[in-house]
């Protein structure tokens, strides 16, 4: 079914930041001694290359910035959400936090009032 | 159906580096002059926070590294790929049915040897 393609493409988008290191960390990749380690920049470039391959409307021959590529990735995924037109499942609640120290836990260090923008 | 969850979760992972600017560009967001710009670090932290919210098996109360979160995100999406790649069960001689929510519970576990590389 068509839904597989975007999920797989999206999977590439998330995963390939450190694809080889993940495979090695999980005992499934080649030993790092047998090949040159990829730098984070190489991993990032690889990720955007894969996105160019996987997302329609991002031809590899054109000059697009990383933000432009992400914009097209997002548009593509939003389109897929419209096609699927079903709500996503979610958790029952956030983490349990102590009443008094709740605002000081490591996960809550970033400014939380900014969180409403990524939904 | 739950198939949307990975797309949405993955969308958060890809999008939230620059979601507000995208919303503004597409005429959906507030003008940037009305609020403080988010730093890249804040966006990344928010992104992982959203992943914790969206991916089963990544309870927000636990301490997980970003790599561990991504590993679980990848495993989850791979699980969904397996489910999406197989026809959903239906009544004998009946029509093909959409994936049922029960098939995508957080407890869904596929054979881990299928998850070898980040492809």
């Amino acid at each position: 079914m068509k839904a597989l393609s975007p999920v797989r493409g999206c999977y590439e988008a998330v995963c390939c930041l450190s694809e080889r290191s993940l495979a090695i960390a999980r005992g499934r990749g080649k030993s790092p001694s047998t090949e040159e380690p990829l730098s984070l920049l190489d991993d990032m470039n690889h990720c955007y290359s894969r996105l160019r391959e996987l997302v329609p409307g991002v031809p590899r021959g054109t000059q697009l910035s990383q933000v432009e590529i992400l914009q097209r990735v997002i548009d593509y995924i939003l389109d897929l959400q419209v096609v699927l037109a079903e709500p996503a499942p979610g958790p029952p609640d956030g983490p349990h936090l102590p009443i008094q120290t709740a605002e000081l836990t490591p996960e809550l260090v970033i400014s939380k009032d900014k969180r409403s923008f990524c939904h | 159906m739950k198939a949307l969850s990975p797309v949405r979760g993955c969308y958060e992972a890809v999008c939230c580096l620059s979601e507000r600017s995208l919303a503004i560009a597409r005429g959906r967001g507030k003008s940037p002059s009305t609020e403080e710009p988010l730093s890249l670090l804040d966006d990344m932290n928010h992104c992982y926070s959203r992943l914790r919210e969206l991916v089963p098996g990544v309870p927000r109360g636990t301490q997980l590294s970003q790599v561990e979160i991504l590993q679980r995100v990848i495993d989850y999406i791979l699980d969904l790929q397996v489910v999406l790649a197989e026809p959903a069960p239906g009544p004998p001689d009946g029509p093909h049915l959409p994936i049922q929510t029960a098939e995508l519970t957080p407890e869904l576990v596929i054979s881990k040897d299928k998850r070898s590389f980040c492809h």
Epitope: E86, P87, A88, P89, G90, P91, P92, D93, G94, P95, H96, L97, I99, A102, E103, L108, K112, D113, R115, S116, C118, H119 | K2, S49, R50, E53, P56, G57, P59, T101, T105, P106, E107
Partner: antibody, heavy 111, light 111 residues
Framework: QSVEESGGRLVTPGTPLTLTCTAS????????IHWVRQAPGKALEWIGY??????TYYASWAKGRFTISKTSSTTVDLKMTSLTTEDTATYFC???????WGPGTLVTVSL | AVLTQTPSPVSAAVGGTVTISCQSS????????LSWFQQKSGQPPKLLIY???KLESGVPSRFKGSGSGTQFTLTIIDVQCDDAATYYC????????????FGGGTEVVVK
């Protein structure tokens, strides 16, 4: 740190009503906020929540008639439409973790 | 999902032990996302136990939670007069709706 509900009153069937949950001592944009109701002499009933990121989820019976939204960093609204006598209850808001509850606000739907 | 609690009322003598069960028709989130609340007349619920067995701050250690998946138990040892109340379980689920569901409540009467 506390929350308090307001807006409960006597209304006639079909009248829309909006309840407000107001936080003190913390920002609602940092936490999930749940709405729960309890009809007189009956069990607690979860209505829905709004997450810190603004995502909303509802009980299946509440979908379509109830809407949860953030109106500021200290207030969350519960909008109710097509009210019937069955919606007569005390409505509570609770913070993430369900360890902080408001005292409740009574909504009475009667002819 | 449906959460079924021990029928009310349950009687206990001061100093005795009370056990309340809560059964879910499907596994809760992470197999442990179940909470217990105490509610007295005219008051909001008070969280006692979260994530099956974790004691909320300030709650006496006489309250113990156990279970996993679909079957859960709240045990009150050395029952006190103050423990007379209605107790609710709350199950959490990874879902598109009905993410949280309360049990029907169990009234505990202390003799």
């Amino acid at each position: 740190q506390s929350v308090e509900e307001s807006g409960g009153r006597l209304v006639t069937p079909g009248t829309p009503l909006t309840l407000t949950c107001t936080a003190s001592g913390f920002s609602l944009s940092s936490y999930y906020i749940h709405w729960v109701r309890q009809a007189p002499g009956k069990a607690l009933e979860w209505i829905g929540y709004i997450s810190d990121g603004g995502t909303t989820y509802y009980a299946s019976w509440a979908k379509g008639r109830f809407t949860i939204s953030k109106t500021s960093s200290t207030t969350v609204d519960l909008k109710m439409t097509s009210l019937t006598t069955e919606d007569t209850a005390t409505y509570f808001c609770a913070r993430q973790g369900f360890n902080i509850w408001g005292p409740g606000t009574l909504v009475t739907v009667s002819l | 999902a449906v959460l079924t609690q021990t029928p009310s009322p349950v009687s206990a003598a001061v100093g005795g032990t009370v056990t309340i069960s809560c059964q879910s028709s499907q596994s809760v989130y992470n197999n442990n996302w179940l909470s217990w609340f105490q509610q007295k007349s005219g008051q909001p619920p008070k969280l006692l136990i979260y994530e099956t067995s974790k004691l909320e701050s300030g709650v006496p250690s006489r309250f113990k939670g156990s279970g996993s998946g679909t079957q859960f138990t709240l045990t009150i040892i050395d029952v006190q007069c103050d423990d007379a109340a209605t107790y609710y379980c709350l199950g959490g689920y990874w879902s598109t709706s009905d993410n949280n569901i309360f049990g029907g409540g169990t009234e505990v009467v202390v003799k």
